[in-house]
């Protein structure tokens, strides 16, 4: 009995031609909704003349429906038993699963103006970019539609730049006809328990972007994993979105759709400080927005990013240290709207449901040289937008996985 | 020890352009801006413009937008500036000098003095 | 732009004596002020950056204060090769300015 079951898994769950395993990872069969939340700034002016607390109210959620194309260029290599391939980007707006249209207007930090400011330190430089911020009438918080946001706008201070720079900006841009990757991971065909793990990425067993350990791509990329996945396991995957790999826990059991899955979660630890958790030393780069390295919460990934100060984090700042969150005003974290989940069915290894759910900010410093960053007195980690992306197994699939694997094995 | 070696002096004809150079030597040429100063009896001690050869970025004084351009060649540490449609009123000694905001340091060249003269 | 007001535009001061020049800013500069000295037929030389900070080799006789829009040029004890033309610049914000220049002569 067990030992079949066991042989049919082992077979089904191969990423190659002619398994359920492959067929569903190619294209996945689950629908995928990516929900964002903008934070509105209320007070933009207080901030940029007095250096207040900045009051931000959430708008959301704006709901698209992403991951809904196949991989492509999926390449078998029969010698080190891999498959390569490439992610596609798309995101289509769904109105129906939104508070608002993509033309709804926020008040947000001036992306432009916050990157140069940092990624060019030189106060000469500075001095030429204040010139071009005050000639295009430019200023610390912009006003923008959701579809100029996330997408990309091109912005009147960096059409001024008089040397080679990219004049689009957006926090997702470029996203639509671009392609994540290229992923190398393993078939499983000679080893199962390597099944889906990466082996390399962009042809790197490494980022470049972290020091030591950090660096490593660990894990799967989270859509599954090897089978007969143990509750004392700690799940390693990759996610090209924060630029690193991290872990997961398991926290419970729960009933999905009448199939027995595992709830694994990011536990807390995976974002405490080098002080509480000393194997995140190394993603600890720079020691004064750190205060040190004992801030916790906020993941500096400019080094991902081509220098612009962009911080990832849990929404609202959940798990993060107090002096983090302490400039903004109108945040409110709990585990349950805002921690990351993955639901596994464990026998195939597959992740039948999950909830990623991450915070994008933007680091703003004083400048004495840019007139519209010259009153503030502190440093600010920006919340800009905070996102939930989930997919759960539909109800046809649940049947058909039900009949299929859990139900033979009860 | 760090030294502006600026070009010889120059005799010109009134709408010729002119091209004054001042090779660095003795420090890291891109890390530092280069600025160019006008000086003649009548109106003192006038900057009119720098450039950071790290990047080709540079800021003019308005009143030299259109007469003068700064260029700088990283590979021989040279900073250029070309003065062009000359007139009387170019006739001056032209300084590069060096700085590193915030502080503004002591390296100025010998100077290039520029006679526009039929 | 900024207007850099020097005073006086000439004196006359003995031996030892205490010299001070000011300059005035249109606006606040921030304390981003240099003085230069510059002899008959020479390039001008930095003696003072961001108002009051000394170029090393510069004698310590010579000295800087102010803030917001009003600086001085201190020598506490004039010496004969300290005659010449001096001269404030901003460099707050573009374009950098210069002062007229005082010209200092020994009585």
């Known amino acids: 009995g067990d030992l079949l079951i066991q042989k049919t898994i082992k077979k089904q769950v191969v990423l190659e031609e002619g398994t359920i395993a492959f067929k569903n990872w190619v294209k996945t069969g689950t629908e995928v909704y990516r929900q964002f939340w903008i934070f509105d700034v209320q007070n933009p002016q207080e901030v940029m003349m007095n250096s207040s607390n900045i009051q931000v109210k959430q708008r959301g959620p704006y709901t698209y429906r992403v991951r809904f194309l196949a991989k492509e260029n999926v390449t078998q290599d029969a010698e080190d038993n891999t498959v390569s391939f490439l992610q596609p980007n798309g995101a289509i707006f769904e109105p129906s699963l939104s508070v608002g249209t993509e033309a709804d207007n926020f008040t947000v930090l001036n992306l432009a103006v916050a990157a140069a400011s940092h990624i060019y330190q030189n106060q000469f430089v500075q001095m030429i970019l204040n010139s071009l911020i005050n000639k295009s009438k430019s200023s610390m918080f912009q006003v923008r539609t959701l579809r100029e946001l996330l997408w990309g706008y091109r912005d009147p201070f960096l059409s001024l730049v008089p040397y080679p720079v990219t004049t689009t900006v957006g926090l997702f841009y470029p996203y639509n006809n671009t392609a994540d990757g290229v992923y190398k991971v393993f078939n499983g065909k000679d080893n199962i328990s390597k099944v889906a793990i990466i082996d390399t990425y962009k042809g790197k067993r490494n980022l470049s972007y972290w020091e030591s350990h950090c660096d490593m791509i660990n894990g799967t990329d989270a859509a599954s994993f090897p089978p007969f996945v143990e509750k004392s396991q700690v799940l390693q995957f990759f996610s090209s979105d924060i630029c690193r790999s991290i872990y997961a826990v398991f926290e419970s059991d729960v009933n999905l759709k009448g199939i027995p899955v595992y709830r694994f979660v990011l536990p807390s630890k995976a974002f405490a400080s080098p002080v509480e958790n000393p194997d995140n030393y190394c993603f600890c780069t720079e020691k004064i927005i750190s205060k040190n390295c004992t801030s916790y919460g906020v993941l500096d990934i400019s080094k991902c990013k081509e220098g612009r100060p962009v911080y990832i984090s849990l929404p609202h700042f959940l798990y993060a240290s107090p002096d983090v969150s302490e400039p903004i005003d109108g945040l409110n974290p709990n585990e349950e709207e805002h921690r990351t989940y993955l639901d596994i069915e464990p026998i195939t290894g597959f992740t039948l449901q999950f909830a990623k759910r991450l915070q994008v900010n933007l680091l703003v410093k004083p400048s004495e040289k840019i007139q519209v960053l010259k009153n503030l007195k502190r440093n600010y980690i920006v919340p800009i937008l905070w996102l939930n992306e989930t997919g759960t197994i539909g109800d046809e699939k649940a049947n058909m996985f039900r009949s299929q694997v859990t139900g033979k094995i009860n | 020890q760090a030294q502006l070696q600026q070009s010889g002096a120059e005799l010109v004809r009134p709408g010729a352009s002119v091209t004054l150079s001042c090779k660095a030597s003795?420090?890291?040429?891109?890390?530092?801006?280069m600025n160019w100063v006008k000086q003649t009896p009548v109106h003192g001690l006038e900057w009119i413009g720098a450039?950071?050869?790290?990047?080709?970025?540079?800021a003019y004084n308005q009143k030299f937008k259109g007469k003068a351009t700064l260029t700088a060649d990283k590979s021989s540490s040279t900073a250029y500036m070309e003065l062009r449609s000359l007139t009387s009123e170019d006739s001056a000694v032209y300084y590069c000098?060096?700085?590193?905001?915030?502080?503004?340091?002591?390296?100025w060249g010998q100077g290039t003095l520029v006679t526009v003269s039929a | 732009e900024i207007k850099m007001t020097q005073s006086p535009s000439a004196m006359y001061a003995s031996l030892g004596e205490r010299v001070t020049i000011t300059c005035k800013a249109s606006?606040?500069?921030?304390?981003?002020l240099s003085w230069f000295q510059q002899k008959p037929g020479k390039s001008p030389k930095t003696l003072i950056y961001?108002?009051?900070r000394l170029v090393d080799g510069v004698p310590s006789r010579f000295s800087g204060s102010g803030s917001g829009q009003d600086y001085s040029l201190t020598i506490s004890s004039l010496e004969f090769e300290d005659m010449g033309i001096y001269y404030c610049?901003?460099?707050?914000?573009?374009?950098?300015?210069f002062g007229g220049g005082t010209k200092l002569e020994i009585k």
């Open positions: 000098t060096r700085s590193k905001l915030p502080a503004w340091f002591p390296y």
């Open positions: 003795g420090y890291t040429f891109t890390d530092y801006e």
């Open positions: 450039i950071d050869p790290e990047i080709g970025g540079s």
């Open positions: 606006q606040d500069i921030n304390s981003y």
């Open positions: 961001r108002a009051n």
């Open positions: 610049l901003q460099y707050e914000e573009f374009p950098y300015t």
